[in-house]
Interface confidence: medium
């Protein structure tokens, strides 16, 4: 029988109000709201935490009955969307001690592990795996890529009694190892003998010049000559002008520095490599995995461009579990989102379509009335002229 | 601690331009520019990151536009075809990011009337 420790799928209505407390820890935090955006695969089910001001800290929590992973799994799973096309912010999730006091908790508040999805720019696409180990917060030592699409996401991590983790998005494994090779919590296992230094006589040169080569007498030969085919301009007044020089022009004959053969070093060792030994510092710690109080997820994130939506938590010591409930939320509603992103899409379209059709319509229904016009006041000007022919004869009989 | 300095609003006519800009003392991964109009929510309008890729709010694209001196340390909005609905208090932000850890800073905020 699995263990569920926490599980939110916001199906209650304002119910959440009561199970997630806000901090006070700044008066300006960002709020959340319960919506399942502007397009989803069901308004129901796919309601969530939606970050709704943009430019905002948010720091939401909900506690949970204290529990310890020792000696058994630890899965984290939420799904997250950030249908706002974001730039910049967190979509990550924050694992507390019951210690935390919910109401002042902020950026600074310790945690025992970090997971999930970031974006910052170009720069930063990673999910964080960030482990609290003896105080201090430790990141992997590798690049995990995260979504950064428009469409609901299902992120899990799992830490397992054995000190191995895995990292799955949409069901699927991304990252999976050991946690002391993947996190440096540990000093490594081997040091470089500080007793051991390359020996002097030690040859780490490949080639060597060959001893036998010598330059050969007719090398020298200067980089730049006078212009052989240069002839002083007749008009040249060595008084005025000086004494004449010819242009210097490259010496087809200059060879560059000689530089004797290379040969195979008969005394090369190869690259001395410095040996290893074992550690002092080092003891394996076979509890990294392990902490004695998990009580309180939390969010604490930042965002440029609101609109995020956190949904389908779930804390369980179950992998099966986690991956049917997963398969149940996200992957019941992920074909029926899309399907409706994308009749927004093609609505979006046309629409922009029949908007260009009817101002490329106006624009030469106005063009067209601007060459009536035009056309008009050309013959109007025709007549005035016509008239004014005729006028000219009629004025000068009546002088006369 | 990083300090921002914002400069260049005021009033200007319906069509008219105006360039704020922001100087910032201190390391920035992005700079952004926001606005609040009275009796309204602070609204984004364009950020800038490091990398370079830029994005604007769809109330200001092809109007506004952003752009950054490195060696001033300084992010500039220039403010073309403004419209009445432009009026706000426009704040510039920068954000410093470390691991999953986000300090931002705020400018005091400048000014911009759009009116006839």
């Known amino acids: 029988e699995p263990a569920v420790y926490f599980k939110e799928q916001f199906l209650d209505g304002d119910g959440w109000t009561s199970r997630w407390i806000e901090s006070k820890h700044k008066s300006d935090f960002g709020k959340f709201v319960l919506s399942s955006g502007k397009f989803y695969g069901d308004e129901e089910k796919d309601k969530g935490l939606q970050t709704s001001q943009d430019a905002r800290f948010y720091a939401l929590s909900a506690s949970f009955e204290p529990f310890s992973n020792k000696g058994q799994t630890l899965v984290v799973q939420f799904t997250v969307k950030h249908e706002q096309n974001i730039d910049c912010g967190g979509g990550y999730v924050k694992l507390f001690p019951n210690s935390l006091d919910q109401t002042d908790m902020h950026g600074d508040s310790e945690y025992n592990i970090m997971f999930g999805p970031d974006i910052c720019g170009p720069g930063t696409k990673k999910v964080h795996v960030i482990f609290n180990y003896k105080g201090k917060n430790v990141l992997i030592n590798k690049d995990i890529r995260c979504k950064d699409d428009e469409f609901t996401h299902l992120y899990t991590l799992i830490v397992r009694p054995d000190n191995t983790y895995e990292v799955k998005i949409d069901n699927s494994q991304v990252e999976s190892g050991s946690l002391e090779d993947d996190w440096d919590f540990l000093p490594p296992k081997k040091i470089k003998d500080p007793d051991a230094s390359k020996p002097e006589d030690w040859d780490e040169r490949a080639k060597i010049d060959d001893p036998t080569d010598s330059k050969p007498e007719d090398w020298d030969k200067p980089e730049h000559i006078p212009d052989p085919d240069a002839k002083k301009p007749e008009d040249w007044d060595e008084e005025m002008d000086g004494e004449w020089e010819p242009p210097v022009i490259q010496n087809p004959e200059y060879k560059g520095e000689w530089k004797p053969r290379q040969i195979d070093n008969p005394d090369y060792k190869g690259t001395w490599i410095h040996p290893e030994i074992d550690n002092p510092e080092y003891s394996p710690d076979p509890s990294i995995y392990a902490y004695d109080n998990f009580g309180v997820l939390g969010l604490d994130l930042w965002q440029v461009k609101s609109g995020t939506i956190f949904d389908n938590f779930l804390i369980t010591n179950d992998e099966a579990y986690a991956e049917e409930f997963g398969n149940e939320t996200w992957g019941v509603t992920k074909a029926a989102e899309k399907q409706m992103k994308d009749k927004q899409d093609e609505e979006q379209r046309l629409k922009e379509e029949e908007e260009d059709k009817k101002r490329k319509e106006e624009e030469e229904a106005e063009d067209k009335e601007d060459d009536e016009d035009k056309d008009e006041d050309e013959e109007d000007e025709e007549d005035k002229e016509e008239d004014e022919e005729e006028d000219v004869p009629g004025q000068a009989k009546d002088e006369l | 601690q990083v300090q921002l300095q914002e400069s260049g609003g005021g009033l200007v006519q319906p069509g008219g331009s105006l360039r704020l800009s922001c100087t910032a003392s201190g390391s920035i991964a992005a700079f952004g520019w926001y606005r609040q109009a009275p009796g309204k929510q602070r609204e984004f309008v364009a950020n800038?990151?490091?990398?370079?890729?830029?994005r604007y709010s769809d109330s200001v694209k092809g109007r506004f536009t952003i752009s950054k001196d490195n060696a001033k340390n300084t992010a500039y909005l220039q403010m073309n075809i403004l419209k009445p609905e432009d009026t706000a208090v426009y704040y510039c932000n920068a954000l410093v990011r470390f691991e999953g850890r986000n300090d931002d800073y705020w400018g005091q905020g400048t000014q911009v009337t759009v009116s006839s």
């Open positions: 800038m990151y490091v990398g370079g890729s830029i």
